[in-house]
Interface confidence: low
């Protein structure tokens, strides 16, 4: 059976439809209606109950960057809230609170950077205490043709319910006072997002008059954030007229929640930011709008912006890495909830702990660097996704290693050099997050030196030879010795050992061919020889 509009108005727990913001991937969002109680004669406290934010599913294609109207009829969004009675004007009979919202559910999700959460879809209103301790709301949420309703209970402040002395018996019927009739009246604000106006309906009152006009004709096309004071309301069944004040809320499509967490700090911080879109602060008094952000399970992480709406960032720092936080972000209008988002945010992977490397027993040109497998500490550090191992003598070389290795053989080293090895673990979260580098160092063993460079021979006299050379490119050891061997006809003649490469060989035979062999000795190893042939002259004397 298709419900008629009147059926819908009598329903107390209908799902509400609001204009939809751009579809986004599914996100943990929940919104509860605010409760705004409106009292007559300026003592109003209004309790709004906008409902649950829509969680859009990942397969949806994005909408254009504009507010997409609700499919729920007339491109409108209706809120429902009730005002509480003034303490001087109790409503006759009182009222009972509707059932609470059964088990609010949140859908796990994460927040892509700079993503707007659509403020959308009030679901069903619930009891909510406004600022006044005397506040009690009988909140009903109705699904009228245009969507959800924000019902404002608008008590009057003129006159108490009519009573007679106990001893008096009256047979005639007296009219109910309008203060009593309208003191507990429900006002449905219907938001027409197409033209950003509200319609206010006085619920369950037939032929309500606002002044001399039908309220139905007067209380529409209300501008958001406007207030209408001292509206004289009555109908045929009550007297005298009473007054009510209406405080029209801003459209919830004007608010969107964005993730503003810097990637670099996403492991220990959550940043959320309410932004407004097309909210005219000339007409909407920012003093009436404020917000609160609170993330559990932290106790003292709360941002509050009271009595002003500044679309600034609220960043909670010093949080635990890789931890699920439930963040409640609320927009308050006149001190009570207009929009509530409940979002599950997981902080990014923490900085991993780097194990201490051991540089092992080095050879001349390689060594094995090893380290223990990391022990994961869920409180802070995350298991590494990999390692970066760097080694340097003068210049540095680095190697990226997978997380399943615990050793690496460093090769192509230079003999007899001091090396420093640094190892750091990293995780790939929203950014690569590096742990603190741990170091070890080693000294490679000596190896054979290179040949000497630039060996030259010359004949200063007829029977003497000068031999000079430069040092090897790499000495590969601790000491510096130059060794000269002189040979002639394949036979050993003489040998010199000096710390510099400047040899003077004299008293040689005249007119004889000699072979000069120079090698370098580094105190551990001797290198290959460089050979030069030279002949002495005949004796000129």
């Amino acid at each position: 059976q298709t419900p008629t509009p009147s059926d819908e108005l009598s329903t107390t727990e209908n799902a509400l439809l609001l204009p939809q913001s751009d579809p986004l991937p599914a996100r943990t969002t929940e919104s509860t209606p605010p409760s705004i109680s409106e009292r007559g004669n300026g003592s109003s406290e209004t309790t709004y109950h906008p409902g649950v934010l829509s969680t859009l599913l990942p397969h949806l294609s994005p909408q254009p960057d504009s507010q997409t109207p609700s499919a729920g009829g007339a491109d409108t969004q209706t809120f429902s809230s009730q005002a509480d009675n003034p303490t001087l004007t109790p409503a006759p009979g009182g009222g009972t609170d509707p059932p609470g919202v059964p088990g609010e559910r949140t859908v796990p999700g994460t927040i892509p950077a700079d993503t707007a959460f659509p403020v959308d879809t009030p679901s069903l209103a619930r009891n909510s205490s406004a600022a006044s301790p005397t506040h009690t709301s009988n909140v009903s949420t109705t699904d009228i043709s245009s969507g959800a309703s924000l019902t404002t209970l608008t008590p009057s402040t003129l006159g108490l319910a009519s009573t007679d002395p106990p001893s008096t018996t009256i047979a005639t019927t007296t009219k109910q006072t309008c203060a009593a009739m309208f003191g507990n009246i429900t006002v449905n604000y219907t938001y027409e997002s197409s033209n950003q106006t509200f319609k206010a309906d006085l619920k369950d009152v037939q032929n309500a008059k606002c002044g001399n006009e039908d309220c139905e004709n007067v209380l529409n096309n209300l501008e958001e954030c406007s207030q209408i004071k001292n509206i004289s309301v009555s109908n045929d069944s009550c007297a005298p007229a009473t007054t009510i004040d209406l405080y029209v809320p801003p459209g919830t499509d004007k608010f969107s929640l964005h993730d503003c967490t810097p990637k670099e700090k996403a492991n220990t911080s959550i940043c959320l930011e309410w932004k407004t879109k097309n909210l005219d602060f000339r007409k909407c008094n920012s003093d009436n709008i404020s917000y609160v952000l609170h993330c559990e399970p932290e106790n003292n992480t709360k941002c509050i912006r009271r009595n002003t709406f500044i679309p600034e960032r609220c960043q909670l720092d010093n949080l635990r890495a890789q931890t699920n936080y439930t963040c409640v972000a609320e927009i308050l209008y006149r001190g009570v909830k207009l929009v509530k988002n409940v979002i599950n945010v997981q902080t990014d992977l923490g900085i991993p702990e780097t194990p201490k490397p051991s540089c092992g027993d080095p050879a001349a040109r390689k060594t094995l660097v090893s380290w223990p497998e990391p022990v994961s500490k869920p409180e802070s550090a995350s298991k590494p996704h990999g390692y970066v191992l760097c080694y340097k003598n003068n210049s540095e070389k680095c190697k990226s290693l997978p997380n399943n290795v615990t050793s690496f053989e460093v090769e192509s080293l230079k003999p007899y050099k001091y090396y420093e090895v640094s190892l750091l673990a990293y995780v790939n979260g929203k950014i690569q997050r590096n742990g603190t580098a741990e170091k070890c160092n080693f000294h490679t063993k000596a190896d054979r030196p290179d040949k000497v460079n630039g060996m030259k021979t010359s004949r200063p006299t007829d029977n003497s030879i000068n031999v000079t050379c430069g040092p090897p490119y790499e000495t590969n050891g601790p000491k510096t010795f130059y060794i000269l061997v002189v040979r002639s006809g394949g036979s050993f003649v003489t040998k010199y050992n000096k710390t510099n490469c400047q040899f003077y060989v004299d008293n040689l035979y005249y007119s004889t061919d000699y072979e000069f062999l120079v090698s370098f000795h580094n105190g551990v190893y001797e290198g290959d020889s460089v050979i030069r042939n030279e002949s002495t002259n005949f004796n000129a004397k």
């Epitope: 298709t2 419900p3 008629t4 509009p5 819908e8 727990e13 799902a15 509400l16 439809l17 939809q20 579809p23 969002t29 929940e30 919104s31 409902g51 649950v52 934010l53 829509s54 969680t55 859009l56 599913l57 949806l60 609700s70 499919a71 729920g72 009829g73 919202v101 059964p102 088990g103 609010e104 559910r105 949140t106 859908v107 959308d120 879809t121 679901s123 069903l124 699904d143 043709s145 969507g147 959800a148 409940v342």
Partner: nanobody, 118 residues
Framework: QVQLVQSGGGLVQPGGSLRLSCAAS????????MGWYRQAPGSQRELVAS??????SYADAVKGRFTISRDYAKNIIYLQMNSLKPDDTAVYFC??????????????WGQGTQVTVS
């Protein structure tokens, strides 16, 4: 999951008529609101008509010319478009929205149907 399959659409002369249909499958949807949106080239998607709990509403531009109806038994909505104008040329999308008391809502969209009035 809800799947929406659209049909209808095509090329029609000004003043002519077309009927679009959108069949939802995968789940009963009597609690959902369904509607039609359209998007002309270079424009943003706009609501054309919607129907929820038996109550229909229309964008001003199509009032009196378009009629939205819904077959609850077959999970189908229809958009009867009469007196079509060139301004009605757009891709028409079927929309399905359910709002849940548990705290979130779901939107689903059809694949889109081209309507050209020329």
């Amino acid at each position: 999951q809800v799947q929406l399959v659209q049909s209808g659409g095509g090329l029609v002369q000004p003043g002519g008529s077309l009927r679009l249909s959108c069949a939802a499958s995968g789940r009963a949807f009597n609690s959902a609101a369904m509607g039609w949106y359209r998007q002309a080239p270079g424009s943003q998607r706009e609501l054309v008509a919607s129907i929820s709990a038996g109550t229909a509403s229309y964008a001003d531009a199509v009032k009196g010319r378009f009629t939205i109806s819904r077959d609850y038994a077959k999970n189908i909505i229809y958009l009867q478009m009469n007196s079509l104008k060139p301004d009605d040329t757009a891709v028409y999308f079927c929309n399905y929205r359910t709002t849940y008391t548990s705290g979130y809502s779901e939107d689903y969209w059809g694949q889109g149907t081209q309507v050209t009035v020329s």
